[in-house]
Interface confidence: low
């Protein structure tokens, strides 16, 4: 969490941002809140990005003002206009690109004063893994697949019964480049699976960590997946 305070002759207002991660090809949110003002027409929101000359987005007098917007953001940004009045200056970024990563500044002017806060935005690709029993294999084998990751993640297998065991010798992981030549499909196979055990396939890079669990018994297979974004710090 980053909390910024305004400076200069005018009173300062508190602006708060939260570091976040964007999934390339999807829409992302750059979070920013501020002390609200009574009058929408008195609020100016400017989003800037370090190293970019034009603005990322500007909202003033109750509407978008995009005449100074940098070309790399044209047609891809929006604020939540109906929430500005309650102090939400968050920016929606459409079709997140790898190059959107960097340091952003949320700069606010209201009748109460000015304030700003920086936000670190990471970009990559992350997706839920799915673990299945691979019936094609000669022996009982588990197959963990996740369609989109970038940068290349690490894959670690774990089991409930054999806690702390190293499965690297009995697993094989491959990365297949997807058609857009950036993200990769992750496939990891675990051999010598025993029944009455729960196995976890953990995929992690510096953007996200995802886990796919599978419980294997003689009578049934139960699956569960979850994904967690890393380094979501508020400013």
């Amino acid at each position: 969490l980053i909390i910024g305070f305004g400076i200069s002759g005018r009173h300062s207002i508190t602006v708060t941002t939260v570091a976040s991660a964007g999934n390339i090809g999807e829409d992302g949110i750059l979070s920013c809140t501020f002390e609200p003002d009574i009058k929408l027409s008195d609020i100016v929101i400017q989003w800037l990005k370090e190293g970019v000359l034009g603005l990322v987005h500007e909202f003033k007098e109750g509407k978008d003002e995009l005449s100074e917007q940098d070309e790399m953001f044209r047609g891809r940004t929006a604020v939540f206009a109906d929430q500005v009045i309650v102090g939400n200056a968050s920016l929606r970024l459409k079709n997140v690109q790898l190059t959107d990563a960097g340091t952003y500044k949320c700069y606010i002017i209201t009748s109460k004063g000015k304030g700003n806060a920086n936000l670190e935005y990471k970009t990559g690709a992350f997706s839920m893994p799915e673990v299945n029993v691979d019936y094609n294999a000669s022996s009982e084998t588990l197959r963990c697949e996740a369609p989109r990751w970038f940068p290349q993640p690490t894959v670690v297998w774990a089991s409930q019964v054999d806690q702390g065991a190293n499965f690297s010798e009995v697993s094989n992981t491959s990365f297949e480049l997807n058609s857009e030549n950036v993200t990769m499909k992750v496939v990891s196979v675990l051999y010598n699976v025993t029944i009455n055990n729960t196995y976890s396939c953990m995929i992690e890079n510096d953007i996200a960590k995802a886990t796919g669990d599978i419980k294997v018994t003689e009578s049934e297979i139960k699956r569960r997946s979850h994904l967690q974004l890393l380094n979501s710090k508020a400013s």
Partner: antibody, heavy 120, light 108 residues
Framework: EVQLVESGGGLVQPGGSLRLSCATS????????MSWVRQAPGKGLELLGF??????????EYSASVKGRFTMSRDNSKNSLYLQMNSLKTEDTAVYYC???????????WGQGTTVTVSS | EIVLTQSPDFQSVTPKEKVTITCRAS?????MHWYQQKPDQSPKPWIY???NLASGVPSRFSGSGSGTDYTLTINSLEAEDAATYYC???????????FGGGTKVEIK
């Protein structure tokens, strides 16, 4: 003072080639998008394409009318913009201008233009 | 690709008269820019971001509009305003600058 000066125009036969240059001064060249615009005799302005700035990787976009025949390039060490024109047609006869994007999506400075005549 | 249609193509106007030039976009755009061009001269930026006058442009000029319809207005025409005016906008999909066909303003 910002200046843009085009050169390299002249008379060329259909199917021929020509290279136009745009020498610039008075601003940090690598920070700006640069464009080529032409104007056929008695006609309106037509954008041929543009080349982005350093922050946007110097990538290029071309209009459909010249894509595959014309190539834009820039030499940031010389503060210069170029337009290589191949397979020229009589309809390419025009005054060719280079222009700077102001960061506000419009052209704030233009060169004086250089005339290209394609005729046999 | 967005197409800009200017009207009228030609306007013959007496001095001190009000002139209105319109530019219609084939789909909604966020702002419009205008240029003035005189014979044998390069175009000059005249109005940017819909309503902002470029440096040195007389205050009798103004710009307005939103969505698909934009207007350049000369409040009281003077002889030096005889020129061709072009509208221009930026489209991000595909990324390209587009010009209108131009409106020639002549003094009667």
């Amino acid at each position: 003072e910002v200046q843009l000066v085009e050169s390299g125009g002249g008379l060329v036969q259909p199917g021929g080639s020509l290279r136009l240059s745009c020498a610039t001064s008075g601003f940090t060249f690598s920070d700006y998008y640069m464009s080529w615009v032409r104007q056929a005799p008695g006609k309106g302005l037509e954008l041929l394409g543009f080349i982005r700035n350093k922050a946007n990787g110097y990538t290029r976009e071309y209009s459909a009318s010249v894509k595959g025949r014309f190539t834009m390039s820039r030499d940031n060490s010389k503060n210069s913009l170029y337009l290589q024109m191949n397979s020229l047609k009589t309809e390419d006869t025009a005054v060719y201008y280079c222009a700077r994007d102001s960061h506000r999506t419009y052209f704030d400075y233009w060169g004086q233009g250089t005339t290209v005549t394609v005729s046999s | 690709e967005i197409v800009l249609t200017q009207s009228p193509d030609f306007q013959s106007v007496t001095p001190k008269e009000k002139v209105t030039i319109t530019c219609r976009a084939s789909s909604s755009v966020s702002s419009m820019h205008w240029y003035q061009q005189k014979p044998d001269q390069s175009p000059k930026p005249w109005i940017y971001a819909t309503s902002n006058l470029a440096s040195g442009v007389p205050s009798r000029f103004s710009g307005s509009g939103s969505g698909t319809d934009y207007t350049l207005t000369i409040n009281s025409l003077e002889a030096e305003d005889a020129a061709t005016y072009y509208c221009q906008q930026w489209s991000s999909n595909p990324p390209m600058y587009t010009f209108g066909g131009g409106t020639k303003v002549e003094i009667k």
